[in-house]
């Protein structure tokens, strides 16, 4: 590390004095200090001498000696005070520029350390500092305004008490620049616009930034529009607003509108689309299939998307039958707006009951007329089975009726012993009925089929079982012949989901 002579941290001299500062290092050394007159420099290998024969207040400052060849970058410093009774301040710069929230150093150096107790910082013409100005003082460096704000961009003076009166420095202009985080913030409203030809329309493009230096323009299909600009300042931001007013829109006004703003940090742009239509429109659609099948007891949401201009004047869900005359409860209907011209309407149908199968229609109306979208809801049911013994054309016949949806398939089983359900070990014979007779098949109802099993003689120690199944489940009914006639077992094994 270089060594300075005299080996003191501070040196106090009077104006006109001779000052010699010598620096010695291992290699070549260099001096660095405030730019001031009358210094002469003499270098001799590993030493360097800075001297003046006529010190002035302007020589006040910190002089640092460094050794450029030192990898550790060591340095030594000495602070020189030239205490001039007429000049308590040596101002090193008359303009200081910082960004907001940085510390701003106002470099007014005190020429006499004794005066430190009576120093203060003021604005020019003796005005006090702004409220919340947080500052500190160092006799070697000057006043530091901490975390400077844009509003503190002012002209300042350093004040010292000398013989009971305040002596001011020359003024220092502080410029605090806003930190511009990026291009201006933009809004373009509306985000989407639809108008019927001849109607009025308004598009507003606005940009804001912490700094006043930015440009904004509105363009239509890449053509820059000449629109007067309104400027404002609030919430610590500069705002520039462009408003396009169209009294009677026509098809040439349609298209893409872009709001573009730029500053030193770059450019931002946002776009919207303006549609001009000949007349009002109302379109209904659904992402769902309009024919729905749901298992009884399950829940279903029916959703309709509506695109309309002008806005809807009315809408509702209606149950069109064929069962009860009940109507969907309003609390089960829900509307959500995706944006100005698109809406989603949902009808919630929880835990569906048989009487709720049928047609559900969504109706909507606007000045363009009314539209409807109808869903057909069919419920799926597991089969229900019953068996009776009868005579057809003189032959003993087991008659099995099965109802469910989708249409059930029927299988007959004959098994040994008396049981309410044939298991594999007991089965003697199996008959599949590929084409049972359809007794009823109305829309939204269960399908009822009938299967006949002609039995010449009923075996008394046996069970005849009719099983029906579909995609929902299965059902069965066991028939047990007994000597006094016939006995049937309702389905203890009532339903079964494969």
């Amino acid at each position: 590390i270089p060594v300075i002579e005299p080996s003191v941290p501070e040196l106090v001299v009077k104006p006109g004095a001779t000052v010699t500062l010598r620096c010695v290092g291992n290699g070549s050394v260099e001096w660095d200090g405030p730019p001031s007159p009358h210094w002469t420099l003499y270098s001799d290998g590993s030493s360097s001498i800075l001297s003046t024969n006529n010190a002035t207040f302007q020589n006040t400052g910190t002089y640092r000696c460094t050794e450029p060849g030192d990898p550790l970058g060591g340095s030594a410093a000495i602070h020189l005070y030239v205490k001039d009774p007429a000049r308590p301040w040596n101002v090193l710069a008359q303009e200081v520029v910082v960004f907001e929230d940085q510390d701003a150093l106002l470099p007014c150096l005190l020429t006499d350390p004794v005066l430190e107790a009576g120093v203060s910082l003021v604005r020019v013409r003796g005005r006090p500092l702004m409220r919340h100005t947080n500052y500190s003082f160092s006799p070697w460096h000057g006043f530091t305004i901490h975390r400077a704000k844009f509003i503190q961009s002012q002209d300042y003076q350093c004040s010292a008490l000398m013989g009971g009166r305040k002596v001011m420095s020359i003024s220092i202009r502080l410029k605090v620049q806003k930190v511009i985080p990026g291009p201006p913030a933009l809004t373009l409203v509306p985000a989407e616009l639809v108008r019927i030809r001849g109607e009025a329309a308004q598009i507003v493009c606005s940009a804001s930034s912490v700094d006043v230096n930015f440009d904004v323009f509105l363009q239509h299909n890449n053509t820059k529009l000449a629109i007067p600009q309104q400027s404002d300042f609030h919430n610590n931001r500069y705002q520039k607003v462009l408003t396009l007013n169209l009294d009677q829109v026509d098809f040439q006004h349609a298209g893409n509108y872009s709001c573009v703003a730029s500053n030193v940090q770059g450019k931002h742009s946002t776009s919207m689309f303006f549609r001009v239509v000949e007349s009002a429109y109302l379109n209904l659609s659904s992402e769902q299939n309009l024919i729905q099948e749901v298992t009884v007891g399950e829940g279903l949401n029916l959703k309709v998307m509506v695109e309309a201009y002008p806005g809807l004047q009315g809408f509702n869900w209606t149950y069109l039958g064929p069962f009860s005359d009940h109507q969907p409860e309003p609390k089960l209907a829900n509307a959500t707006t995706k944006d100005t011209y698109r809406h989603t309407f949902t009808l919630s149908l929880p835990r569906l009951k048989p009487s709720e199968a049928g047609r559900y229609s969504f109706l909507a109306r606007n000045p363009g007329g009314w539209r409807a979208l109808t869903f057909e809801l069919t419920l799926r049911y597991p089969p229900e089975v019953s068996v009776i013994w009868t005579f057809i054309n003189g032959s003993g016949t087991l008659l099995c009726a099965a109802s469910g949806y989708p249409q059930p398939n029927v299988t007959w089983l004959q098994c040994s012993g008396h049981t309410d359900r044939c298991d594999e070990a007991q089965v003697l014979q199996v008959w599949d009925d590929p084409y049972p007779e359809v007794l009823s098949q109305e829309p939204f109802h269960k399908v009822t089929v009938q299967s006949l099993l002609t039995v010449e003689t009923l075996e008394h120690n046996q069970t005849y079982e009719c099983r029906a199944h579909n995609s929902v489940g299965s059902g069965s009914w066991a028939f047990i012949p007994i000597s006094a006639g016939a006995h049937t077992h309702p389905p203890d094994e009532f339903l079964f989901t494969p």
């Epitope: 399950e298 919630s348 929880p350 835990r351 048989p354």
Partner: antibody, heavy 116, light 106 residues
Amino acid sequence: RVQLKESGPGLVAPSQSLSITCTVSGFSLTSYDISWIRQSPGKGLEWLGVIWSGGGTNYNSPFMSRLRISKDDSRSQVFLKVNRLQTDDTAIYYCVRDLRLYFDVWGAGTTVTVSS
Amino acid sequence: KIVMTQSPKSMSVSVGERVSLSCKASEDVGTYVSWYQQKPEQSPKLLIYGSSNRYTGVPDRFTGSGSATDFTLTISSVQAEDLADYSCGQSFTYPTFGTGTKLEIK
């Protein structure tokens, strides 16, 4: 006052059938649906099925093959029959008034233990 | 099958404390969620239906909220008589219930 009261056998042997009767008062079975819900220590509350006011039934899939619910409107009674019981059918069985979107009134429950 | 998951399994609170019980559905169930309180040796009682509607006679310290898959039962100021199991259930499709949260009083 709306009330539901279950009556059951208490103890049932494995592979046998369980029959429980629920007697209601303070409302009519022709106007309200009734669900059966059970509570076993390991499984919490489990919905078994419902009999609608009109007499139709709807069962929870896992129980479809061995469950039957029926009723007698005139006697204000609902019946639950469960076949082929196993030890994990041990539970408290509740009959509950079912308002479709929630269950507003619960019976006191009947404890059924399946054990040999 | 829609699975209802409740958390925490149990919690211990002091009288006067505010408590929130969570219930999550494995699929969107709209607002078809109800909350049931079951005190020891008693059958469940309906507290909240339709996610946020308080059933007749239920004290107003009980509040329900939520929709789609996330639901909450809040007791604004727990009382000693609130010691119970709390279960949520959905009724959009075949009804299912959560496994319950046991509320203990410190």
